[in-house]
Structures are given as structure tokens and as C-alpha cells.
């Protein structure tokens, strides 16, 4: 059940989730999706220019329900999906115009989750079962990493120390995580 493509609010198909692993079972199909550029945060990576501010890591807003067995969250949660491609900001498509995908000729660069946040969700269960409150991990920001090989395992290397876009007002709440496929913690373990 991998998602090969989905629509955003600019009505273009973005074939970006096909490379991701199958998402956790409790992820339902996205109900809404819209694109958000990287808020001007430049990831650290030298492509063909020394001006890192020219590069951007695309972030997509993703709204989904969290499920846990037969239970489902009362409300959908919104998080980010990190687009698989990093490139010059001027070439990344925005919500109105259609930019061209830029692909580096050298190493493989990926836009991946960087910081996570935790959010409490109320899970409603069938059959009169009491609601469950659960904390889930949600992607809070993305960054660019370079893909290298390590012991036959894919290993992603940071471009630099900078990384997350600071969140306005307050530091992202301690813990939460997730991956490209995005997140929720799966099966009810109890």
C-alpha cells in the first residue's frame, strides 16, 4: 500500500512518497495536503555554489488521522512530510508556479525529518470502549542530508550543524519523531 503520488492544493501530482517505505498501519490516507516551502531556512550543503542560502528543502503539510487498532483519533493531526529532493530554492516548485525538479549530478541529497514534536491525541474506539489518550510523534521540520553507503546500509549524513528551522515563539516540544512515511506509533502494544 505505498503511496505512489498524491495531490497538493496546487493540483499537481508530486510523486514523492513512492520512494518511502510503506507508512505505519495507523496512517490513514491524507485528507488534505498543501505545500510549504522551507521558510527561508537554508540547509547546509555545498552543491555548485558557495551560497548555501540558495538551497532549500521542501516541506509539505500533511493531515491525517491516527489509528491504533480499531481506534481512530477524534481529530486529524497535521505534520510535515519532507520532500525527497533538495535543491536550489529558485528551482523548487511553489504552490502557484511549476518549477523544475533540480537534480544534483554528484551525491544524492535528500530532504529528511530533522526535528520532531509530540502531540497528544484522543483515540475513539468502537463498542463503547473508553477513549485512549496517546502521544504521537510528528515531524516539526526538515533538513537536507547526503546519502552515502555504510556497511551496505543506507546512511544519511548531515550537511552541517545547523539543521532545524527554529520554531517561532517556543522551542519544539521535546520529543517526537518520524520518518518520511510519517508517523504515528503503531499498533496498540498493550
Amino acid at each position: 500500500q505505498g503511496w505512489q503520488a498524491f495531490k497538493n492544493d496546487a493540483t499537481e501530482i508530486i510523486p514523492e512518497l513512492g520512494e518511502y517505505p510503506e507508512p505505519p498501519p495507523e496512517l490513514e490516507n491524507n485528507k488534505t495536503m498543501n505545500r510549504a516551502e522551507n521558510g527561508g531556512r537554508p540547509p547546509h550543503h555545498p552543491f555548485e555554489t558557495k551560497d548555501v542560502s540558495e538551497y532549500s528543502c521542501r516541506e509539505l503539510h500533511f493531515t491525517r488521522y491516527v489509528t491504533d487498532g480499531p481506534c481512530r483519533s477524534a481529530k486529524p493531526v497535521t505534520e510535515l512530510v519532507c520532500s525527497g529532493q533538495c535543491g536550489p530554492a529558485r528551482l523548487l516548485p511553489n504552490a502557484i508556479g511549476r518549477g523544475k525538479w533540480w537534480r544534483p549530478s554528484g551525491p544524492d541529497f535528500r530532504c529528511i525529518p530533522d526535528r520532531y514534536r509530540a502531540q497528544r491525541v484522543q483515540l475513539l474506539c468502537p463498542g463503547g470502549e473508553a477513549p485512549r489518550a496517546r502521544k504521537v510523534r510528528l515531524v516539526a521540520s526538515c533538513k537536507c542530508k547526503r546519502l552515502t553507503r555504510f556497511h551496505n546500509q543506507s546512511e544519511l549524513k548531515d550537511f552541517g550543524t545547523e539543521a532545524a528551522r527554529p520554531q517561532k515563539g517556543r522551542k519544539p516540544r521535546p520529543r517526537a519523531r518520524s520518518a518520511k512515511a510519517n508517523q504515528a506509533e503503531l499498533e496498540n502494544a498493550y
Epitope: 505505519p24 526535528r115 544519511l156 517526537a176 502494544a189
Partner: antibody
Framework: QVQLVESGGGLVQPGGSLRLSCAAS????????LSWVRQAPGKGLEWVSN????????YYADSVKGRFTISRDNSKNTLYLQMNSLRAEDTAVYYC??????????WGQGTLVTVSS | DIALTQPASVSGSPGQSITISCTGT?????????VSWYQQHPGKAPKLMIY???NRPSGVSNRFSGSKSGNTASLTISGLQAEDEADYYC???????????FGGGTKLTVL
């Protein structure tokens, strides 16, 4: 039932390397974050590293950053910890743990790593 | 960074109730996040006893309960039994990857 079984521990000299494995079964491996936690003899628990669902995001304790690498193979339901430049203070029992809803609901039995000359 | 502080040891007699505290300190968080408690018997792996401050996984006795007030979380064990003698660790999460932070551990002795 959920099972996590660590292996790969042993005696290694300072500066040496070791690779730990954690074989998982009884649950949907690719759907969980996983962590390594260690416990030095007579000491408390210390989180070492964690990894997200597909291995794209990894995090490390400052004490091991740059020396340890966590990875996972979802096709083999296995978690790894590559430990390089080992030091005496890395001597500990290393546990792998399954992370669900921001806590560790299942742990392996642990594997002992001894760094000594 | 968040740091969690626990008493090194507590003790009680069978049938009594005891409480283990876990106090959080942080430069940026006024009160600690959701806390979990783990029990560890000598030579064994830790076992989850309480999660999200006051929830018990199935199979854990209802003699174990958790609570939180401000930046201090507490684990209470009522009707103390000999098999409760173990080390207890509180934990929460912190950092960009929401990584686990453990308290120093508390040794519970059943007299």
C-alpha cells in the same frame, strides 16, 4: 509475542570496533522507532541512540556521537549499532528497545560489551 | 536539556506504600513532559511499569500508580511485596529526536 534479541557483544580493546545486532520478531518492525540503551556495571540506564521508521533520521547521545552509528534493515527486521573507537567507559550491557508512543514498551535481554586491554 | 533527579534509595515494609519521586530540571521546559517508569531486577532487562505519567500497561499490577505535579513525577507502590524490590527509573523525552532521558534510578528495598 514481541521479541528483541541482541547479539554481537564481547571483549574488545580500546580503540577497537564492534557491531551489535538486534533481531526483532512478533511485531511490524518497520512501524516503530527503535533505540539502543546501555547500562554500565552498577550504574543507571543511559540512552545511546535512536532511529526512525525508515532509518533516515538518527540521533545520538553526546558521549557516542561521531563514534557510533545506528542503522536498521527493515527487510531483515534487524537493528544495528556500529561502535568504533571504543573506550573503557563504553563498557556496558547494551539493550535494544522498541519505542511506542514515546516510551519503551519492549526491551531485549541485553548484550555485554567489555572494552579492556 | 532536561535532567531527572531521583532519590538513590527508598525502603518499606511488606504491605506498606512507598513513593519514589522524579524531579525534572530544564532550561526551557517549565514542567517535565510525560513520564514513564521502568522496573529493573538485578541482571534483567528493564520493564515498563507506567507510561504517560499514570497509565499502566496490561499485565502490570494496579498496585503501581503514577502522578505528576509541576516538575515532579511520582511512582507509588501500594501493598509492598518482596518481589517489588528492584531498581526503578523514571524517564521522559527531549531533544530534536525526542530521545529518552533517564533519571539516575532508585533502589527499592523491601524490609
Amino acid at each position: 509475542q514481541v521479541q528483541l534479541v541482541e547479539s554481537g557483544g564481547g571483549l574488545v580493546q580500546p580503540g577497537g570496533s564492534l557491531r551489535l545486532s538486534c533481531a526483532a520478531s512478533g511485531f511490524t518492525f518497520r512501524s516503530h522507532w527503535l533505540s539502543w540503551v546501555r547500562q554500565a556495571p552498577g550504574k543507571g540506564l543511559e540512552w545511546v541512540s535512536n532511529i526512525n521508521y525508515d532509518g533516515s533520521s538518527t540521533y545520538y547521545a553526546d558521549s557516542v556521537k561521531g563514534r557510533f552509528t545506528i542503522s536498521r534493515d527493515n527487510s531483515k527486521n534487524t537493528l544495528y549499532l556500529q561502535m568504533n573507537s571504543l573506550r573503557a567507559e563504553d563498557t556496558a550491557v547494551y539493550y535494544c528497545a522498541r519505542d511506542t508512543y514515546l516510551h519503551f514498551d519492549y526491551w531485549g535481554q541485553g548484550t555485554l560489551v567489555t572494552v579492556s586491554s | 536539556d532536561i535532567a531527572l533527579t531521583q532519590p538513590a534509595s527508598v525502603s518499606g515494609s511488606p504491605g506498606q506504600s512507598i513513593t519514589i519521586s522524579c524531579t525534572g530540571t530544564s532550561s526551557d521546559v517549565g514542567d517535565i513532559n510525560d513520564v514513564s517508569w521502568y522496573q529493573q531486577h538485578p541482571g534483567k532487562a528493564p520493564k515498563l511499569m507506567i507510561y504517560d505519567v499514570n497509565n499502566r500497561p496490561s499485565g502490570v499490577s494496579n498496585r503501581f500508580s503514577g502522578s505528576k505535579s509541576g516538575n515532579t513525577a511520582s511512582l507509588t507502590i501500594s501493598g509492598l511485596q518482596a518481589e517489588d524490590e528492584a531498581d526503578y527509573y523514571c524517564s521522559t523525552y527531549d531533544g530534536p529526536g525526542l530521545s529518552e532521558v533517564f533519571g539516575g534510578g532508585t533502589k527499592l528495598t523491601v524490609l
